[in-house]
Interface confidence: low
Protein backbone atom coordinates (compact mmCIF):
# COMPACT_ATOMS: atom_id res chain seq x y z
CA UNK A 1 0.00 0.00 0.00
CA UNK A 2 1.33 3.40 -0.81
CA UNK A 3 0.37 6.73 0.58
CA UNK A 4 2.09 9.52 -1.18
CA UNK A 5 2.30 13.22 -0.76
CA UNK A 6 2.31 13.69 -4.46
CA UNK A 7 3.23 17.23 -5.18
CA UNK A 8 1.01 19.10 -7.61
CA UNK A 9 3.05 20.20 -10.59
CA UNK A 10 2.70 23.17 -12.83
CA UNK A 11 1.65 22.14 -16.31
CA UNK A 12 2.62 24.05 -19.42
CA UNK A 13 -0.09 25.16 -21.78
CA UNK A 14 -1.15 22.39 -24.12
CA UNK A 15 0.45 22.58 -27.54
CA UNK A 16 -1.89 23.55 -30.28
CA UNK A 17 -4.00 25.91 -28.25
CA UNK A 18 -2.21 28.85 -29.75
CA UNK A 19 -0.25 29.54 -32.89
CA UNK A 20 3.46 28.86 -32.99
CA UNK A 21 4.25 32.53 -32.42
CA UNK A 22 1.98 32.75 -29.42
CA UNK A 23 3.43 29.59 -27.96
CA UNK A 24 6.97 30.87 -28.32
CA UNK A 25 6.19 34.18 -26.71
CA UNK A 26 4.72 32.38 -23.73
CA UNK A 27 7.67 30.06 -23.19
CA UNK A 28 9.92 32.64 -21.54
CA UNK A 29 7.22 33.99 -19.20
CA UNK A 30 6.28 30.44 -18.29
CA UNK A 31 9.85 29.47 -17.45
CA UNK A 32 10.22 32.67 -15.45
CA UNK A 33 6.94 32.02 -13.69
CA UNK A 34 8.16 28.55 -12.76
CA UNK A 35 11.42 29.94 -11.47
CA UNK A 36 9.75 32.74 -9.56
CA UNK A 37 7.22 30.52 -7.90
CA UNK A 38 9.59 27.71 -7.13
CA UNK A 39 12.66 29.69 -6.11
CA UNK A 40 12.90 29.39 -2.37
CA UNK A 41 9.81 27.18 -2.25
CA UNK A 42 11.02 23.63 -2.77
CA UNK A 43 8.86 20.65 -1.94
CA UNK A 44 9.27 17.41 -0.07
CA UNK A 45 7.32 14.31 -0.99
CA UNK A 46 6.63 11.44 1.36
CA UNK A 47 5.52 7.95 0.47
CA UNK A 48 4.52 5.47 3.17
CA UNK A 49 3.99 1.82 2.32
CA UNK A 50 3.05 -1.12 4.46
CA UNK A 51 4.77 -4.25 3.25
CA UNK A 52 2.30 -6.93 2.19
CA UNK A 53 4.65 -9.65 3.40
CA UNK A 54 5.11 -8.17 6.85
CA UNK A 55 1.97 -6.35 7.90
CA UNK A 56 3.72 -4.44 10.62
CA UNK A 57 6.69 -3.46 8.49
CA UNK A 58 6.72 -0.05 6.84
CA UNK A 59 8.77 1.54 4.13
CA UNK A 60 9.00 5.31 4.11
CA UNK A 61 10.42 7.06 1.08
CA UNK A 62 11.06 10.78 0.95
CA UNK A 63 12.38 13.06 -1.72
CA UNK A 64 13.37 16.67 -2.06
CA UNK A 65 12.26 18.65 -5.10
CA UNK A 66 14.53 21.62 -4.92
CA UNK A 67 17.64 22.96 -6.52
CA UNK A 68 19.79 23.32 -3.43
CA UNK A 69 22.33 21.01 -1.85
CA UNK A 70 20.90 18.72 0.79
CA UNK A 71 22.84 18.95 4.03
CA UNK A 72 20.70 16.81 6.30
CA UNK A 73 17.59 14.61 6.20
CA UNK A 74 15.63 13.79 9.34
CA UNK A 75 12.86 11.19 9.40
CA UNK A 76 10.52 11.21 12.37
CA UNK A 77 7.19 9.75 13.38
CA UNK A 78 4.27 10.95 15.42
CA UNK A 79 4.41 14.41 13.86
CA UNK A 80 7.05 16.90 12.79
CA UNK A 81 10.42 16.47 14.46
CA UNK A 82 10.31 19.76 16.30
CA UNK A 83 6.69 19.39 17.39
CA UNK A 84 6.59 16.24 19.43
CA UNK A 85 7.78 13.84 16.75
CA UNK A 86 10.37 11.19 17.49
CA UNK A 87 13.44 10.90 15.30
CA UNK A 88 13.80 7.61 13.47
CA UNK A 89 16.79 8.38 11.27
CA UNK A 90 19.17 11.13 10.35
CA UNK A 91 21.03 10.99 7.06
CA UNK A 92 23.93 13.24 6.19
CA UNK A 93 25.37 13.05 2.68
CA UNK A 94 28.97 12.90 3.91
CA UNK A 95 28.88 12.01 7.57
CA UNK A 96 26.72 8.94 7.08
CA UNK A 97 23.52 7.59 8.53
CA UNK A 98 22.13 7.17 12.02
CA UNK A 99 18.95 5.36 12.84
CA UNK A 100 17.00 4.39 15.93
CA UNK A 101 14.78 1.46 16.74
CA UNK A 102 12.43 0.48 15.26
CA UNK A 103 14.17 1.74 12.11
CA UNK A 104 15.84 -1.20 10.42
CA UNK A 105 17.52 0.28 7.38
CA UNK A 106 17.92 3.84 6.24
CA UNK A 107 19.68 4.62 2.98
CA UNK A 108 20.09 7.16 0.24
CA UNK A 109 18.24 6.11 -2.89
CA UNK A 110 19.32 9.03 -5.04
CA UNK A 111 21.07 12.31 -4.40
CA UNK A 112 17.76 13.77 -3.30
CA UNK A 113 15.71 10.88 -1.95
CA UNK A 114 15.99 8.44 0.90
CA UNK A 115 14.21 5.34 2.11
CA UNK A 116 13.68 3.90 5.56
CA UNK A 117 12.45 0.46 6.53
CA UNK A 118 10.82 0.06 9.93
CA UNK A 119 10.66 -3.09 12.00
CA UNK A 120 7.18 -3.98 13.09
CA UNK A 121 7.41 -5.70 16.43
CA UNK A 122 7.20 -4.60 20.02
CA UNK A 123 5.77 -1.62 21.82
CA UNK A 124 7.64 0.86 19.69
CA UNK A 125 6.43 -0.50 16.36
CA UNK A 126 4.45 1.73 14.02
CA UNK A 127 0.79 1.30 13.33
CA UNK A 128 -1.36 2.23 10.39
CA UNK A 129 -2.33 5.71 11.50
CA UNK A 130 1.16 6.79 12.50
CA UNK A 131 2.33 9.99 10.83
CA UNK A 132 5.81 9.92 9.32
CA UNK A 133 7.63 13.15 8.54
CA UNK A 134 10.69 13.88 6.47
CA UNK A 135 12.64 17.07 6.88
CA UNK A 136 15.28 18.15 4.38
CA UNK A 137 17.76 20.83 5.34
CA UNK A 138 19.28 22.32 2.25
CA UNK A 139 21.20 25.33 1.07
CA UNK A 140 19.96 27.83 0.12
CA UNK A 141 16.31 26.91 0.62
CA UNK A 142 16.50 26.14 4.32
CA UNK A 143 14.59 23.39 6.08
CA UNK A 144 11.48 21.84 4.54
CA UNK A 145 9.29 19.10 5.91
CA UNK A 146 6.40 16.96 4.72
CA UNK A 147 4.43 14.27 6.47
CA UNK A 148 2.45 11.26 5.38
CA UNK A 149 0.59 8.36 6.92
CA UNK A 150 -1.37 5.29 5.99
CA UNK A 151 -5.14 5.34 6.18
CA UNK A 152 -6.07 2.91 8.99
CA UNK A 153 -8.36 0.86 6.78
CA UNK A 154 -6.05 0.42 3.81
CA UNK A 155 -5.02 -3.01 2.68
CA UNK A 156 -1.37 -3.80 2.04
CA UNK A 157 -0.35 -3.48 -1.55
CA UNK A 158 -3.14 -1.09 -2.53
CA UNK A 159 -2.75 2.54 -3.44
CA UNK A 160 -3.88 5.08 -0.92
CA UNK A 161 -4.90 8.68 -1.44
CA UNK A 162 -2.20 11.35 -1.36
CA UNK A 163 -1.14 12.65 2.02
CA UNK A 164 -1.00 16.35 2.81
CA UNK A 165 1.68 18.17 0.91
CA UNK A 166 4.59 19.84 2.67
CA UNK A 167 4.44 21.99 5.72
CA UNK A 168 4.85 25.64 4.82
CA UNK A 169 8.02 26.19 6.72
CA UNK A 170 11.55 27.29 5.95
CA UNK A 171 13.47 27.37 9.18
CA UNK A 172 16.43 29.10 7.67
CA UNK A 173 14.13 31.47 5.86
CA UNK A 174 15.51 30.28 2.53
CA UNK A 175 18.64 32.36 2.33
CA UNK A 176 17.75 35.08 -0.11
CA UNK A 177 20.44 34.45 -2.67
CA UNK A 178 18.52 32.45 -5.25
CA UNK A 179 15.32 34.41 -4.84
CA UNK A 180 17.20 37.68 -5.08
CA UNK A 181 18.92 36.68 -8.30
CA UNK A 182 15.52 35.88 -9.79
CA UNK A 183 13.89 39.06 -8.63
CA UNK A 184 14.71 40.82 -11.85
CA UNK A 185 13.26 37.93 -13.81
CA UNK A 186 10.07 38.09 -11.82
CA UNK A 187 9.71 41.80 -12.49
CA UNK A 188 10.32 41.14 -16.15
CA UNK A 189 7.71 38.42 -16.05
CA UNK A 190 5.13 40.83 -14.69
CA UNK A 191 6.01 43.19 -17.48
CA UNK A 192 5.53 40.48 -20.08
CA UNK A 193 2.29 39.32 -18.55
CA UNK A 194 0.97 42.87 -18.70
CA UNK A 195 1.86 43.08 -22.38
CA UNK A 196 0.09 39.79 -23.01
CA UNK A 197 -3.03 40.61 -21.04
CA UNK A 198 -5.23 40.00 -24.04
CA UNK A 199 -3.94 36.44 -24.41
CA UNK A 200 -5.48 33.57 -22.41
CA UNK A 201 -3.37 32.84 -19.37
CA UNK A 202 -1.70 29.46 -19.10
CA UNK A 203 -3.57 27.09 -16.84
CA UNK A 204 -2.16 25.80 -13.59
CA UNK A 205 -3.20 22.22 -13.68
CA UNK A 206 -2.45 19.97 -10.73
CA UNK A 207 -1.12 16.63 -11.81
CA UNK A 208 -0.30 13.47 -9.95
CA UNK A 209 3.29 13.29 -11.02
CA UNK A 210 5.29 10.36 -9.81
CA UNK A 211 7.95 11.45 -7.35
CA UNK A 212 10.33 9.00 -8.90
CA UNK A 213 10.79 11.34 -11.84
CA UNK A 214 10.64 14.74 -10.30
CA UNK A 215 12.46 16.51 -13.09
CA UNK A 216 11.21 14.63 -16.11
CA UNK A 217 9.39 17.47 -17.81
CA UNK A 218 11.37 19.19 -20.51
CA UNK A 219 9.69 22.53 -19.99
CA UNK A 220 10.83 22.87 -16.41
CA UNK A 221 14.38 24.03 -15.73
CA UNK A 222 16.33 21.04 -14.51
CA UNK A 223 17.53 22.71 -11.35
CA UNK A 224 14.23 24.29 -10.39
CA UNK A 225 11.68 22.69 -8.18
CA UNK A 226 8.60 21.49 -9.95
CA UNK A 227 6.55 21.93 -6.90
CA UNK A 228 4.91 25.24 -6.32
CA UNK A 229 1.52 24.57 -4.85
CA UNK A 230 1.33 23.97 -1.12
CA UNK A 231 -1.34 22.38 0.97
CA UNK A 232 -1.06 23.43 4.61
CA UNK A 233 -0.26 20.58 6.96
CA UNK A 234 -2.23 19.92 10.08
CA UNK A 235 -0.63 17.87 12.79
CA UNK A 236 -2.28 14.48 13.06
CA UNK A 237 -2.56 13.20 16.60
CA UNK A 238 -2.29 9.47 16.43
CA UNK A 239 -3.24 7.01 19.07
CA UNK A 240 -0.19 4.99 18.19
CA UNK A 241 2.70 6.78 19.83
CA UNK A 242 6.08 5.14 20.03
CA UNK A 243 7.11 3.95 23.44
CA UNK A 244 10.18 5.37 25.14
CA UNK A 245 13.08 3.61 23.52
CA UNK A 246 15.66 1.96 25.66
CA UNK A 247 18.42 -0.46 25.10
CA UNK A 248 16.41 -3.62 25.40
CA UNK A 249 16.29 -3.42 21.64
CA UNK A 250 19.46 -4.82 20.10
CA UNK A 251 20.06 -1.61 18.24
CA UNK A 252 21.62 1.49 19.65
CA UNK A 253 23.67 4.41 18.58
CA UNK A 254 25.88 7.29 19.38
CA UNK A 255 25.61 10.94 18.88
CA UNK A 256 28.38 11.42 16.41
CA UNK A 257 27.77 14.32 14.11
CA UNK A 258 30.87 16.10 13.08
CA UNK A 259 30.36 19.73 12.26
CA UNK A 260 28.00 20.08 9.36
CA UNK A 261 28.88 22.38 6.47
CA UNK A 262 26.56 25.31 6.19
CA UNK A 263 27.03 25.73 2.47
CA UNK A 264 27.68 22.46 0.69
CA UNK A 265 28.96 23.33 -2.75
CA UNK A 266 28.17 19.98 -4.29
CA UNK A 267 25.31 17.57 -4.50
CA UNK A 268 25.24 14.78 -1.91
CA UNK A 269 27.33 11.80 -2.85
CA UNK A 270 25.71 9.25 -0.60
CA UNK A 271 26.84 8.15 2.83
CA UNK A 272 30.57 8.28 3.13
CA UNK A 273 33.12 6.84 5.48
CA UNK A 274 33.98 9.56 7.92
CA UNK A 275 34.74 8.15 11.31
CA UNK A 276 38.44 8.13 10.67
CA UNK A 277 38.49 11.75 9.56
CA UNK A 278 36.64 13.68 12.22
CA UNK A 279 36.62 17.44 12.33
CA UNK A 280 37.56 19.21 15.53
CA UNK A 281 35.14 21.85 16.67
CA UNK A 282 36.35 25.34 15.98
CA UNK A 283 34.82 28.60 14.98
CA UNK A 284 31.29 29.80 15.28
CA UNK A 285 28.16 27.77 14.79
CA UNK A 286 25.12 28.62 12.76
CA UNK A 287 21.88 26.94 13.70
CA UNK A 288 20.63 24.53 11.10
CA UNK A 289 17.72 22.83 12.82
CA UNK A 290 16.77 20.61 15.68
CA UNK A 291 19.84 21.09 17.77
CA UNK A 292 22.20 20.18 14.96
CA UNK A 293 24.50 22.96 13.92
CA UNK A 294 26.61 23.80 10.96
CA UNK A 295 30.08 25.01 11.54
CA UNK A 296 30.70 28.09 9.49
CA UNK A 297 33.86 28.27 7.49
CA UNK A 298 34.87 24.66 7.74
CA UNK A 299 34.30 21.89 5.24
CA UNK A 300 34.59 18.19 5.92
CA UNK A 301 36.89 16.23 3.68
CA UNK A 302 34.92 15.31 0.60
CA UNK A 303 34.62 11.67 -0.16
CA UNK A 304 33.27 10.25 -3.33
CA UNK A 305 30.28 8.05 -3.97
CA UNK A 306 30.30 4.38 -3.25
CA UNK A 307 31.80 4.65 0.21
CA UNK A 308 29.61 3.39 2.96
CA UNK A 309 29.89 4.05 6.62
CA UNK A 310 28.69 0.58 7.50
CA UNK A 311 30.26 -2.00 5.20
CA UNK A 312 28.67 -4.84 7.14
CA UNK A 313 25.80 -6.06 4.91
CA UNK A 314 23.59 -6.26 7.98
CA UNK A 315 24.01 -2.52 8.34
CA UNK A 316 24.77 -0.56 11.48
CA UNK A 317 23.42 -1.26 14.89
CA UNK A 318 20.24 0.62 14.09
CA UNK A 319 21.06 3.56 16.17
CA UNK A 320 18.86 4.34 19.07
CA UNK A 321 21.15 6.99 20.42
CA UNK A 322 20.60 10.37 21.88
CA UNK A 323 19.59 12.45 18.91
CA UNK A 324 15.92 13.08 19.24
CA UNK A 325 14.80 9.93 20.97
CA UNK A 326 11.85 10.47 23.24
Amino acid sequence: MRTEAQVPALQPPEPGLEGAMGHRTLVLPWVLLTLCVTAGTPEVWVQVRMEATELSSFTIRCGFLGSGSISLVTVSWGGPNGAGGTTLAVLHPERGIRQWAPARQARWETQSSISLILEGSGASSPCANTTFCCKFASFPEGSWEACGSLPPSSDPGLSAPPTPAPILRADLAGILGVSGVLLFGCVYLLHLLRRHKHRPAPRLQPSRTSPQAPRARAWAPSQASQAALHVPYATINTSCRPATLDTAHPHGGPSWWASLPTHAAHRPQGPAAWASTPIPARGSFVSVENGLYAQAGERPPHTGPGLTLFPDPRGPRAMEGPLGVR
Partner: antibody, heavy 119, light 107 residues
Framework: EVQLQQSGPELVKPGASVKISCKAS????????IHWVKQSHGKRPDWIGY????????GYNQNFRSRATLTVDKFSSTAYMELRSLTSEDSAVYYC????????????WGQGTSVTVSS | DIQMTQSPDSLSASVGETVTITCRTS??????LVWYQQKQGKSPQLLVY???TLAEGVPSRFSGSGSGTQFSLKINSLQPEDFGTYYC?????????FGGGTKLEIK
Protein backbone atom coordinates in the same frame (compact mmCIF):
# COMPACT_ATOMS: atom_id res chain seq x y z
CA GLU B 1 33.67 28.34 30.07
CA VAL B 2 31.65 25.18 29.54
CA GLN B 3 30.72 23.67 32.89
CA LEU B 4 28.49 21.07 34.48
CA GLN B 5 27.92 21.76 38.16
CA GLN B 6 26.50 18.87 40.14
CA SER B 7 24.66 18.93 43.45
CA GLY B 8 26.39 18.00 46.69
CA PRO B 9 26.97 14.63 48.37
CA GLU B 10 24.00 12.60 49.56
CA LEU B 11 23.59 10.21 52.46
CA VAL B 12 20.39 8.22 52.10
CA LYS B 13 18.76 5.21 53.71
CA PRO B 14 18.15 1.94 51.90
CA GLY B 15 14.85 1.92 50.04
CA ALA B 16 14.81 5.70 49.72
CA SER B 17 15.29 7.81 46.59
CA VAL B 18 17.84 10.40 45.61
CA LYS B 19 17.66 13.15 43.03
CA ILE B 20 20.88 14.61 41.70
CA SER B 21 21.06 17.80 39.66
CA CYS B 22 23.50 18.85 36.96
CA LYS B 23 23.42 22.51 35.99
CA ALA B 24 24.95 23.44 32.66
CA SER B 25 26.58 26.76 31.87
CA UNK B 26 28.79 28.25 29.20
CA UNK B 27 26.97 26.76 26.22
CA UNK B 28 23.53 26.38 24.69
CA UNK B 29 21.86 23.72 26.80
CA UNK B 30 20.09 22.01 23.90
CA UNK B 31 23.35 21.53 22.00
CA UNK B 32 24.52 18.71 24.20
CA UNK B 33 23.04 15.49 25.48
CA ILE B 34 23.53 15.00 29.20
CA HIS B 35 24.65 11.52 30.12
CA TRP B 36 24.74 9.97 33.56
CA VAL B 37 27.47 7.60 34.65
CA LYS B 38 27.86 5.61 37.87
CA GLN B 39 31.29 4.78 39.20
CA SER B 40 31.66 2.62 42.25
CA HIS B 41 34.95 2.92 44.12
CA GLY B 42 37.76 1.38 42.13
CA LYS B 43 35.43 0.11 39.41
CA ARG B 44 34.92 0.96 35.79
CA PRO B 45 32.28 3.59 34.99
CA ASP B 46 28.79 2.31 34.21
CA TRP B 47 26.57 4.21 31.81
CA ILE B 48 23.08 4.88 33.18
CA GLY B 49 21.41 6.79 30.38
CA TYR B 50 21.07 10.22 28.87
CA UNK B 51 18.85 13.25 28.70
CA UNK B 52 18.18 14.82 25.32
CA UNK B 53 17.50 18.45 26.25
CA UNK B 54 16.23 19.47 22.82
CA UNK B 55 12.94 17.67 23.29
CA UNK B 56 13.17 16.42 26.86
CA UNK B 57 13.70 12.86 25.73
CA UNK B 58 15.70 10.24 27.55
CA GLY B 59 17.29 6.89 26.90
CA TYR B 60 18.32 4.32 29.46
CA ASN B 61 20.63 1.45 30.08
CA GLN B 62 18.33 -1.50 30.57
CA ASN B 63 20.04 -2.26 33.87
CA PHE B 64 18.84 1.05 35.29
CA ARG B 65 15.60 1.43 33.36
CA SER B 66 13.25 0.46 36.15
CA ARG B 67 14.79 2.62 38.87
CA ALA B 68 16.22 5.69 37.18
CA THR B 69 14.35 8.68 35.82
CA LEU B 70 16.20 11.29 33.81
CA THR B 71 14.63 14.68 33.23
CA VAL B 72 15.65 18.14 32.12
CA ASP B 73 14.52 21.66 32.86
CA LYS B 74 15.39 23.73 29.82
CA PHE B 75 14.60 27.00 31.54
CA SER B 76 17.21 26.49 34.22
CA SER B 77 19.56 24.48 31.96
CA THR B 78 19.54 21.70 34.51
CA ALA B 79 19.40 17.93 34.11
CA TYR B 80 18.23 15.63 36.87
CA MET B 81 18.69 12.00 37.70
CA GLU B 82 16.41 10.35 40.23
CA LEU B 83 17.32 6.91 41.49
CA ARG B 84 14.74 4.96 43.48
CA SER B 85 14.74 1.95 45.81
CA LEU B 86 18.35 2.45 46.76
CA THR B 87 20.52 -0.32 48.15
CA SER B 88 24.12 -0.37 49.31
CA GLU B 89 25.08 -1.38 45.77
CA ASP B 90 24.06 2.10 44.68
CA SER B 91 26.71 3.75 46.81
CA ALA B 92 28.95 5.37 44.23
CA VAL B 93 29.96 8.62 42.59
CA TYR B 94 27.48 9.71 39.93
CA TYR B 95 28.68 11.90 37.09
CA CYS B 96 26.86 13.88 34.50
CA UNK B 97 28.70 14.37 31.23
CA UNK B 98 28.04 16.46 28.14
CA UNK B 99 27.91 14.67 24.83
CA UNK B 100 28.24 16.95 21.85
CA UNK B 101 25.39 16.09 19.50
CA UNK B 102 27.59 16.18 16.42
CA UNK B 103 30.64 14.31 17.57
CA UNK B 104 29.81 11.62 20.03
CA UNK B 105 31.84 11.14 23.16
CA UNK B 106 31.61 12.84 26.55
CA UNK B 107 33.47 16.08 26.09
CA UNK B 108 33.15 17.45 29.59
CA TRP B 109 32.08 16.04 32.90
CA GLY B 110 30.55 17.30 36.10
CA GLN B 111 32.61 17.04 39.25
CA GLY B 112 30.60 14.06 40.45
CA THR B 113 28.09 13.56 43.26
CA SER B 114 28.87 11.06 45.96
CA VAL B 115 25.86 9.01 47.07
CA THR B 116 26.18 6.86 50.15
CA VAL B 117 23.39 4.42 50.96
CA SER B 118 23.53 3.44 54.58
CA SER B 119 21.12 2.75 57.38
CA ASP C 1 25.90 -5.29 25.12
CA ILE C 2 29.34 -4.72 23.65
CA GLN C 3 32.07 -5.98 25.97
CA MET C 4 35.24 -3.93 26.34
CA THR C 5 38.41 -5.72 27.39
CA GLN C 6 41.35 -3.55 28.36
CA SER C 7 44.89 -4.69 28.94
CA PRO C 8 47.00 -4.60 30.93
CA ASP C 9 45.08 -4.02 34.16
CA SER C 10 48.04 -2.12 35.56
CA LEU C 11 51.32 -0.87 34.29
CA SER C 12 54.44 0.58 35.89
CA ALA C 13 56.62 2.89 33.85
CA SER C 14 59.16 5.64 34.28
CA VAL C 15 59.05 9.23 33.15
CA GLY C 16 60.27 9.43 29.55
CA GLU C 17 59.22 5.91 28.62
CA THR C 18 56.66 4.97 26.00
CA VAL C 19 53.68 2.84 26.94
CA THR C 20 50.81 1.28 25.01
CA ILE C 21 47.41 0.32 26.37
CA THR C 22 45.09 -1.87 24.33
CA CYS C 23 41.35 -2.26 24.18
CA ARG C 24 39.46 -5.07 22.50
CA THR C 25 35.73 -5.04 21.76
CA SER C 26 33.36 -7.97 21.44
CA UNK C 27 32.09 -6.75 18.10
CA UNK C 28 33.00 -4.36 15.33
CA UNK C 29 32.57 -0.78 16.51
CA UNK C 30 34.35 0.79 13.53
CA UNK C 31 36.02 3.89 14.99
CA UNK C 32 33.45 4.72 17.65
CA LEU C 33 35.87 4.58 20.55
CA VAL C 34 37.20 7.09 23.04
CA TRP C 35 39.97 7.08 25.64
CA TYR C 36 39.78 8.83 28.99
CA GLN C 37 42.28 9.57 31.69
CA GLN C 38 41.08 9.65 35.28
CA LYS C 39 43.02 10.78 38.30
CA GLN C 40 42.11 9.66 41.79
CA GLY C 41 39.02 11.47 43.06
CA LYS C 42 38.55 13.39 39.80
CA SER C 43 36.24 13.16 36.81
CA PRO C 44 37.44 11.38 33.67
CA GLN C 45 39.03 13.61 31.04
CA LEU C 46 38.63 12.96 27.33
CA LEU C 47 41.88 12.22 25.51
CA VAL C 48 40.96 10.69 22.17
CA TYR C 49 37.73 10.28 20.21
CA UNK C 50 36.90 8.52 16.96
CA UNK C 51 39.67 6.10 17.96
CA UNK C 52 42.46 8.36 16.79
CA THR C 53 41.53 12.03 17.05
CA LEU C 54 43.08 13.96 19.91
CA ALA C 55 40.64 16.04 21.92
CA GLU C 56 41.37 19.73 22.17
CA GLY C 57 44.19 20.57 24.55
CA VAL C 58 45.55 17.03 24.73
CA PRO C 59 49.35 16.84 24.26
CA SER C 60 50.59 15.28 21.06
CA ARG C 61 52.48 12.59 22.96
CA PHE C 62 49.14 10.82 23.20
CA SER C 63 47.96 8.94 20.14
CA GLY C 64 45.13 6.56 19.45
CA SER C 65 44.94 3.92 16.75
CA GLY C 66 42.89 0.98 15.59
CA SER C 67 39.44 0.29 14.24
CA GLY C 68 36.95 -2.53 14.21
CA THR C 69 37.64 -4.51 17.38
CA GLN C 70 41.27 -3.73 18.23
CA PHE C 71 42.37 -0.36 19.56
CA SER C 72 45.36 1.09 21.35
CA LEU C 73 46.44 4.22 23.16
CA LYS C 74 50.11 5.08 23.00
CA ILE C 75 51.81 7.58 25.28
CA ASN C 76 55.24 8.68 24.18
CA SER C 77 57.75 10.16 26.60
CA LEU C 78 55.67 9.78 29.76
CA GLN C 79 55.32 12.84 31.92
CA PRO C 80 54.60 12.91 35.67
CA GLU C 81 51.07 14.19 35.03
CA ASP C 82 50.27 11.20 32.81
CA PHE C 83 49.95 8.79 35.67
CA GLY C 84 46.44 7.69 36.54
CA THR C 85 43.83 5.28 35.26
CA TYR C 86 42.93 5.04 31.57
CA TYR C 87 39.59 3.82 30.27
CA CYS C 88 38.40 3.03 26.79
CA UNK C 89 34.71 3.40 26.01
CA UNK C 90 32.69 2.69 22.89
CA UNK C 91 29.91 4.90 21.64
CA UNK C 92 28.65 2.67 18.87
CA UNK C 93 25.15 2.12 20.10
CA UNK C 94 23.73 2.25 23.56
CA UNK C 95 24.42 1.12 26.17
CA UNK C 96 27.79 2.78 26.06
CA UNK C 97 30.23 0.52 27.89
CA PHE C 98 33.67 1.14 29.38
CA GLY C 99 36.77 -0.98 29.56
CA GLY C 100 37.95 -2.21 32.95
CA GLY C 101 40.67 0.41 33.13
CA THR C 102 44.46 0.39 33.08
CA LYS C 103 46.21 1.86 36.08
CA LEU C 104 49.43 3.55 35.04
CA GLU C 105 51.83 3.95 37.95
CA ILE C 106 55.24 5.49 38.38
CA LYS C 107 58.01 2.90 38.57
Amino acid sequence: EVQLQQSGPELVKPGASVKISCKASGYTFTDYNIHWVKQSHGKRPDWIGYNYPYNGGAGYNQNFRSRATLTVDKFSSTAYMELRSLTSEDSAVYYCAGEEVRRGPFYFWGQGTSVTVSS
Amino acid sequence: DIQMTQSPDSLSASVGETVTITCRTSENIYSFLVWYQQKQGKSPQLLVYNAKTLAEGVPSRFSGSGSGTQFSLKINSLQPEDFGTYYCQHYYGTPYTFGGGTKLEIK
